[in-house]
């Protein structure tokens, strides 16, 4: 978790800064010159800086669910949820959907009455009883209604010759009604006789081009709930046709340019203004159907199935069934489509402000799981088998109290979600205790909130009557320095350092001379990043296990050990697993020093005293030659031949040991003493 904060001076502002931010309410947590914003940081950082766990304010998002058992059967539970949302931190709750048997249904039968549907109309006229009987097998409360459509009554959609407008059918003897866009014939009713009677009066009509004005008619069915008689129950719209459909833009062909407005325009049960408004777009219609919870069933002939399947991909909770050429199978088709629609459950929410984000995890009964989706989705849902959705709601800022609803599309049940902000800190010191603030303010989350005219960490500073010069002196490092290093304000003789706009940069110190960002970088991050070390006033303080000026190294010495496992042979220090040798000694292990002066001359007196107990060091040889150890056997190393104090040549070998000026010395038994002149 990170905590990126800008100009934080209270616990609330801290909590608003992000889900990783926490506030330390500990008294005297800040040192001289420290801004209050250092109280706001991640939990680990505050703990590391000495804030006790129970002094850390970290309000969390939470959900409270509430069942409401008044009313009939409920398919969704709970009925109400209250969320307390902290910005950036999700609150989650479960919604269970249990599909009920016998849920009430309103079914509106919308039929294409263009001439090719003649035999279909004959069959539908006899259908009322069968249709209601079929509904009653599914539900205890079913109602049916009827409407019909042809197309807009302008060229090129219909033939506008006056004779053709009176009787658009190709067969003049056929009794045929004039074309129309949409006629609402029968309001939703449970009276099958009324259905039979009203539909029985309908006459076939006709138009010119193949596509029909079905989307116009569907839009009116959705936009006129009172006229159609929709109840707040499952709403099915059966759309029966044997051809395609016009959509937005096609109106231009008939000089109709005004976009469809999605409103109800029924006059005397006719859509009389269809020649004023263009056809709706598919998206606009999908929107209107979903808004009014209407599920369309497209009952279409075989050649049109593919076209309408494409349409169902855009319209949520819609189905396609293949209609026989004479509509004789329509009851069977509706039953199948209804079962298909009822077994697919989409969980969705209504419009939300940008400050709220909702995602769904769907745990379906067939073992399928969908995570982090914009809506819940389960298929194959069976009656009385519960399925669970986990809903996660996140606020991007401290929101205003509000509510939204969640519904299963096509079903009437809803879950009401109340959303409240979780931005206040319930600090234990809010007792209005004024003593800690010199009686000139009260304590709020560890900070003194001073009365007007007082200032300072403990409201100890009265602003009136004191010159700024008097106070400024203690805000300068010396007379040549600028006040608070130019990075803070001198308040009552104390530097209040500015809050930086740079994420992660904290300005602090008695004179605001320090910050947490101007240190060496490694891998593009200050002190190698928060996992390796922290920047304190220009120097990296590495966490255990790391070292280096930018905490760039993992602490290990394996690469610095010579064959005797001595670090840098005792002639250097191991940094970042590489030797830093004393001057002259060579990497990798500081064993050789090609440029060092010969040690032979330096140790002749030691050779003399160690071997022969003579010479200037004869009396205190061990003190004068502490780094040398005499060997009785020859050694490998530098061979020396030097004159001793008596003028004799002494041959000896120096084998360097680990460390500085440490040798094993082997001295030849015989000295070469040249006799002096006689």
């Amino acid at each position: 978790q990170e905590c990126t904060k800008f100009k934080v001076s209270s616990c609330r502002e801290c909590i608003e800064s992000g889900p990783g931010c926490t506030w330390c309410q500990k008294l005297n947590f800040t040192g001289p010159g420290d801004p209050d914003s250092i109280r706001c940081d991640t939990r680990p950082q505050l703990l590391m800086r000495g804030c006790a766990a129970d002094d850390i304010m970290d309000p969390t998002s939470l959900a409270e669910t509430q069942e409401d058992h008044n009313g009939g059967q409920k398919q969704l539970s709970p009925q109400k949820v209250t969320l307390y949302l902290r910005p950036g931190q999700a609150a989650a709750f479960n919604v269970t959907f249990r599909r009920a048997k016998g849920y009430p249904i309103d079914l509106y039968y919308l039929m294409d009455l263009s001439y090719s549907m003649l035999d279909d109309l004959r069959n539908v006229k006899k259908l009322g009883g069968d249709l209601l009987r079929a509904l009653n097998e599914i539900t205890e409360s079913g109602r049916i209604g009827f409407g019909s459509f042809v197309d807009k009554t302008v060229l090129p959609f219909v033939n506008t010759h006056p004779d053709k407008l009176r009787n658009p059918c190709p067969n003049k003897e056929k009794e045929c009604q004039p074309p129309f866009a949409f006629r609402h014939v029968l309001k939703l009713t449970n009276n099958s006789n009324q259905f039979q009677t009203e539909v029985g009066k309908q006459l076939i009509s006709g138009n010119l081009d193949a596509p029909e004005g079905g989307l116009d008619a569907m839009m009116q069915v959705a936009a006129c709930p009172e006229e159609i008689g929709w109840r707040n129950v499952t709403r099915l719209l059966v759309f029966a046709t044997d051809d395609g459909f016009h959509f937005a833009g096609d109106g231009k062909l008939g000089a109709i340019l005004t976009p469809n407005d999605g409103r109800c325009h029924l006059e005397d049960n006719l859509y009389k203004r269809s020649n004023e408004f263009d056809y709706p777009s598919v998206g606009q219609l999908a929107h209107k159907l979903a808004e009014n919870n209407i599920q369309p069933i497209f009952a279409v002939t075989s050649r049109m199935v593919k076209t309408y399947e494409k349409l169902t991909e855009i319209i949520p909770k819609s189905a396609v069934g293949e209609l026989s050429e004479d509509s004789s199978n329509v009851v069977h088709l509706i039953k199948n489509a209804y079962n298909k629609l009822s077994s697919r459950v989409f969980l969705d929410h209504n419009a939300l402000p940008d400050t709220l984000k909702v995602t769904y995890d769907s745990f379906c009964s067939n073992g399928v799981t969908h995570r982090n989706q914009p809506r819940g989705d389960c298929d194959g849902v069976q009656i009385n088998v519960p399925i669970t959705f986990q809903v996660k709601v996140t606020a991007t800022e401290c929101i205003q109290e509000q509510s939204f609803v969640i519904r299963a599309l096509g079903f009437t049940d809803i879950v009401t979600v109340q959303v409240l902000p979780q931005c206040e800190c319930r600090c234990r010191d809010q007792s209005r205790d004024r003593s800690l603030c010199h009686g000139k303010g009260f304590l709020e989350c560890g900070i003194c909130r001073c009365d007007t005219g007082y200032i300072g960490k403990n409201c100890e500073c009265q602003t009136q009557g004191r010159s700024s010069q008097e106070l400024e002196g203690s805000c300068r490092k010396d007379n040549n320095s600028i006040i608070c290093s130019g990075l803070g304000d001198c308040v009552c003789g104390q530097c209040l350092c500015h809050t930086s706009d740079v994420p992660g940069k904290l300005i602090y110190g008695q004179y605001c001379e320090c910050d947490t960002i101007n240190c060496e970088r490694y891998n593009g991050q200050v002190c190698g990043g928060p996992g390796r070390g922290l920047c304190f006033c220009g120097k990296c303080r590495c966490h255990p296990g790391f070292e280096g000026s930018a905490c760039q190294c993992e602490r290990t010495t394996e690469g610095c050990l010579n064959p005797r496992r001595v670090e840098c042979s005792g002639r250097g220090r191991c940094r970042c697993n590489v030797c830093e040798c004393h001057s002259g000694y060579q990497l990798p292990l500081c064993q050789e020093c090609p440029g060092c002066p010969s040690p032979c001359g330096k140790y002749i007196s030691c050779a003399e005293c160690l071997k022969f107990e003579k010479g200037p060091f004869g009396k205190n040889c061990s003190a004068a030659c502490p780094g040398l150890q005499l060997s009785n056997n020859p050694v490998k190393g530098r061979t020396c031949k030097e004159r001793d104090s008596e003028g004799c040549w002494v041959a000896y070998t120096l084998e360097q040991q680990d460390g500085m000026d440490r040798y094993l010395i082997y001295v030849d038994e015989s000295r070469e003493c040249v006799a002096g002149p006689n």
Partner: nanobody, 114 residues
Framework: EVQLVESGGGLVQAGGSQKLSCAAS???????MGWYRQALGKKRVFVAS???????IYGDSVKGRFTISRDNAKNTAYLQMNSLKPEDTAVYVC?????????WGQGTQVTVSS
């Protein structure tokens, strides 16, 4: 799409009662109806709301004093306000939530005199 008409505002004595109505008309299924209020120079704040299934929510400042109800058949929401205080003085605005958007009324003034 949806038109809202509020009524019932006016002048009332502190401690008294008042009932506001909000009637919705239009071509959209209304899910939630609610009341917000805005005092002079202040932000608009939530008062109460009621879902289509009767679930109610109240703002902290009115809990126990105000009651929201709804007649789904008439698409109308009511706000019964009891024990009114001077600080309840505000313009009370009705909001109706459709599936895709919310619709606001013009508001009705309620003045509580002490």
């Amino acid at each position: 799409e949806v038109q809202l008409v509020e009524s019932g505002g006016g002048l009332v004595q502190a401690g008294g009662s008042q009932k506001l109505s909000c009637a919705a008309s239009g071509s959209t299924l209304i899910y939630t109806m609610g009341w917000y209020r805005q005092a002079l120079g202040k932000k608009r704040v939530f008062v109460a709301s009621i879902s289509r299934d009767g679930s109610t929510i109240y703002g902290d400042s009115v809990k126990g004093r105000f009651t929201i109800s709804r007649d789904n058949a008439k698409n109308t929401a009511y706000l019964q306000m009891n024990s009114l205080k001077p600080e309840d003085t505000a313009v009370y605005v009705c909001k109706a939530e459709g599936w895709y958007q919310g619709y606001w009324g013009q508001g009705t003034q309620v003045t509580v005199s002490s």
